[in-house]
């Protein structure tokens, strides 16, 4: 079928970076400036993505591939292919519709993005708080109160910090 198709459809011979020009007897013409075709046999070239304003160019557009954008400093990418830019905040803050706001008491954020999350409740694991939490850091859980009683022979090491979470995207 593929061989028959290529015999019948001259456009199938047009490589990436060209388009099959119906106005010129289906000759393969190069994509015009600021456009590309990433596959062969295309009848049109796609317009290159423009990285401007909050976006900056990570990879220039070529005749065979689209431009790739990332976000200008102070913002980070969201979505497939960096379809959106979102404002960075400081550690100890989260982004709201009112801008960056400090984490409420009892919550923390150790990243420039994402939401404030509750401190670990050490007592749920039968442990005690070894190091208090802050807006930027989770609490560090230590040995259980029973392990700290007089005559206890050993001290258990602190539990590892939780894996940082990410904001919903």
């Amino acid at each position: 079928f593929e061989r028959t198709r290529s015999l019948q459809d001259p456009c199938s011979n047009c490589p990436a970076g060209t388009f099959c020009d119906n106005n010129r007897n289906q000759i393969c013409s190069p994509c015009p400036p600021n456009s590309f075709s990433s596959a062969g046999g295309q009848r049109t070239c796609d317009i290159c993505r423009q990285c401007k304003g909050v976006f900056r160019t990570r990879k220039e557009c070529s005749s065979t591939s689209n431009a790739e954008c990332d976000c200008t400093p102070g913002f980070h990418c969201l979505g497939a292919g960096c379809s959106m830019c979102e404002q960075d905040c400081k550690q100890g803050q989260e982004l709201t519709k009112k801008g960056c706001k400090d984490c409420c008491f009892g919550t923390f954020n150790d990243q420039k993005r994402g939401i404030c999350r509750p401190w670990t409740n050490c007592s749920l694991d039968g442990k005690s708080v070894l190091v208090n939490g802050t807006k930027e850091r989770d609490v560090v859980c230590g040995p259980s109160p029973a392990d700290l009683s007089p005559g206890a022979s050993s001290v258990t090491p602190p539990a590892p910090a939780r894996e940082p979470g990410h904001s919903p995207q």
Partner: nanobody
Framework: EVQLVESGGGLVQPGGSLRLSCAAS?????KYWMIWVRQAPEKGLEW???????????YYVDSVEGRFTISRDNVNNSLYLQMNSLRAEDTAVYYC????????????????SGQGTTVTVSS
């Protein structure tokens, strides 16, 4: 094609005023939050203000609160930033940007912005 075109920038003395405009086309303007951001020389981009779809919610970065006013005209697909009591530190390229269609619980990103208009505050 989605387009945002800013205008209204210029040179103004400290204490002066400017009104920036942003003409939107290629999308249903009234369905989106809109945002002003700025980039001062040699600095990163900074969020300035945003406004919800019908103009009933407006938020500002602390440094411009009480001096700048964001507004929109959904009939004419336009976004505005009235800038009063301008200071040298307001010198920047100002961009208007399209936010999300729902800020309830997802993100506060922007997916389209214009080329920017330059505001210079100097005596």
């Amino acid at each position: 094609e989605v387009q945002l075109v800013e205008s209204g920038g210029g040179l103004v003395q400290p204490g002066g005023s400017l009104r920036l405009s942003c003409a939107a086309s290629g999308f249903t303007f009234s369905k989106y939050w809109m945002i002003w951001v700025r980039q001062a020389p040699e600095k990163g981009l900074e969020w300035v203000a945003n406004i919800n779809q019908d103009g009933s919610e407006k938020y500002y970065v602390d440094s411009v609160e009480g001096r700048f006013t964001i507004s929109r005209d959904n009939v004419n697909n336009s976004l505005y930033l009235q800038m009063n009591s301008l200071r040298a530190e307001d010198t920047a390229v100002y961009y208007c940007a399209r936010g999300g269609d729902d800020y309830s619980n997802s993100h506060y990103g922007m997916d389209v912005s214009g080329q920017g208009t330059t505001v210079t505050v100097s005596s």
